[in-house]
């Protein structure tokens, strides 16, 4: 009778993580008597996957009924494959012996590669906010995929970005891989509603890439523009001075009025108007009783936005422009009165 051969017909197979892998093996003879064993890897460090003779292998089932003597099919099925199962599997025929069974013949091996989906990309931006015209960096990370080939793209509002660097680790063979990419984005005043998207395409995703997003509203700070104006006289001896705070983001804003350098009133922005671009406007005003002043008054609107150093705008209120007698009928009281829109 011809000497037994161990046939592993598949040089390689590829299986998606979570699925089962079937490793095929047939022998050409019933002799010599002895068990079949499956190993991952070769040499002294090889890992026993299945032993026909003994042991508990909860993830392994035999494809054929090994209790039938004329069975020559020793294929196995490994359930719930993970990237850690990747490797070359050998079907090995042993001859019964002591003190150990003797390896008689090995199959050529079947390389199992595991297709594992990348994790959802996580995009993170800078720790601190930045203002328009500045360049900020965004990072994108995805892990646990296999094989190593992967494509990563960056978009800002649907437009593909080109200024980015990507690394896939590790460089050598591994059960699974990670990707890390850093993109540079120039901020504009219109970016409050903008999104940066990291898109990852991999063979396991069947043409439906994974996306991670970052809203630039978390990253951008648009400083306000200030305008202080004197409104027409509202009542005899009273002047309405307004401070328009325009186009700022985020909302956090505190406004202080100063009269000739002295703090008159501090208020926190509350009822804001939102612009189409996502920035906000706010207005504060003062009612100034000019009859209480002999000299010109310098009114300053000072704004502290999002914890940044204050910016201010001043307005000179000319007292001399009013008739001297206008203060004669005014009851004594505060020199400044204020109001803000509800």
């Amino acid at each position: 009778e011809e000497e037994l051969q161990v046939i592993q017909p598949d040089k390689s197979i590829s299986v998606a993580a979570g699925e089962s892998a079937t490793l095929h093996c047939t022998v050409t003879s019933l002799i010599p008597v002895g068990p079949i064993q499956w190993f991952r890897g070769a040499g002294p460090g090889r890992e026993l996957i299945y032993n026909q003779k003994e042991g508990h292998f909860p993830r392994v089932t035999t494809v054929s009924d090994l209790t039938k003597r004329n069975n020559m099919d020793f294929s196995i099925r490994i359930s719930n494959i993970t990237p850690a199962d990747a490797g070359t599997y050998y079907c090995v025929k042993f001859r019964k012996g002591s003190p150990d069974d003797v390896e008689f013949k090995s199959g050529a091996g079947t390389e199992l590669s595991v297709r594992a989906k990348p994790s959802a990309p996580v995009v993170s931006g800078p720790a601190a906010r930045a203002t328009p015209q500045h360049t900020v960096s965004f990072t994108c990370e995805s892990h646990g995929f296999s094989p190593r080939d992967i494509t990563l793209k960056w978009f800002k509002n649907g437009n593909e970005l080109s200024d980015f660097q990507t690394n896939v680790d590790p460089a050598g063979d591994s059960v699974s891989y990670s990707i890390h990419s850093t993109a540079k984005v120039v901020l504009t005043r219109e970016d409050v509603h903008s999104q940066v998207i990291c898109e990852v395409a991999h063979v396991t995703l069947q043409g439906d890439p994974l996306r991670g997003t970052a809203n630039l509203s978390e990253t951008i700070r648009v400083p306000p523009t200030l305008e202080v104006t004197q409104q027409p006289v509202r009542a005899e001896n009273q002047v309405n001075v307004t401070c328009q705070v325009r186009k700022f983001y985020p909302q956090r804003l505190q406004l202080t009025w100063l009269e000739n350098g002295n703090v008159s009133r501090t208020e926190t922005a509350s009822t804001l108007t939102e612009n189409k671009d996502g920035t906000y406007n706010w207005m504060s005003w003062l009612l100034v009783n000019v009859s209480a002043h002999r000299d010109d008054v310098k009114l300053t609107c000072q704004v502290e936005h999002d914890g940044q150093p204050a910016v201010s705008k001043s307005h000179d209120l000319k007292v001399s422009a009013h008739p001297k007698e206008q203060g004669s009928n005014t009851a004594p009281g505060p020199a400044l009165a204020s109001a803000a829109p509800l």
């Epitope: 008597v33 079949i36 003779k53 090994l66 003597r69 019964k96 002591s98």
Partner: antibody, heavy 118, light 107 residues
């Protein structure tokens, strides 16, 4: 049902011959290593002979040259030709099937009695 | 030839008892050891192969262990039908050899 049925035992004079048969049913005999085991009255079990799937044969020392194991695939039967019989060969002879991959005995026949006496 | 030695040769026990029979090989036999049960006038019945694997239909009260040269058969809770003679056998190499048997009797 997997079954082994022995026949051919009986009384024979020392120096005489006897041919034991074992008819297998429920499985293909040629796919298994097959054995003969004997047991003298009140004694333990003694392995006698085996035939492998490739036709290779094995014997215990005391029967070598006197006993011959064979099989007939068409009849799905195993045989033991016993020549030059001695009083020490008196025993119940069992036909036994070897296990699937390690030749562990799994199926036994009911036995046939061989008595060697003058 | 490989010699197989069983102990004890006979053993008295009661229903419900747990009993252990040992078998020693004269040389390493890996785990190619089988256990058989035989009742008077009957053919032996296969219980265990490769030292610890139960043949189909054998109740789990029977268990085997060991490797190399020392092996044991344990019956966890004796029932009346378990009183019989038990044999061990090595089948790693020809000639296959049996132990002399252990007769388990009712006390």
């Amino acid at each position: 049902e997997v079954q082994l049925v022995e026949s051919g035992g009986g009384l024979v004079q020392p120096g005489g011959s006897l041919r034991l048969s074992c008819a297998a049913s429920g499985f293909t005999l040629s796919s298994y290593d097959m054995h003969w085991v004997r047991q003298a009255t009140g004694k333990g079990l003694e392995w006698v002979s085996a035939i492998g799937t490739a036709g290779d044969t094995y014997y215990t020392g005391s029967v070598k040259g006197r006993f011959t194991i064979s099989r007939e695939n068409a009849k799905n039967s195993l045989y033991l030709q016993m020549n030059s019989l001695r009083a020490g060969d008196t025993a119940v002879y069992y036909c036994v099937r070897g296990g699937v991959w390690d030749d562990a005995f799994d199926i036994w026949g009911q036995g046939t009695m061989v008595t060697v006496s003058s | 030839d490989i010699q197989m030695t069983q102990s004890p040769s006979s053993l008295s026990a009661s229903v419900g008892d747990r009993v252990t029979i040992t078998c020693r090989a004269s040389q390493d036999i890996n785990n190619y050891l089988a256990w058989f049960q035989q009742k008077p006038g009957k053919a032996p019945k296969s219980l265990i192969y490769t030292a610890s694997s139960l043949h189909s239909g054998v109740p789990s009260k029977f268990s085997g262990s060991g490797s190399g040269t020392d092996f044991t058969l344990t019956i966890s809770s004796l029932q009346p039908e378990d009183f019989a003679t038990y044999y061990c056998q090595q089948y790693v190499s020809y000639p296959y050899t049996f132990g002399q048997g252990t007769k388990l009797e009712i006390k």
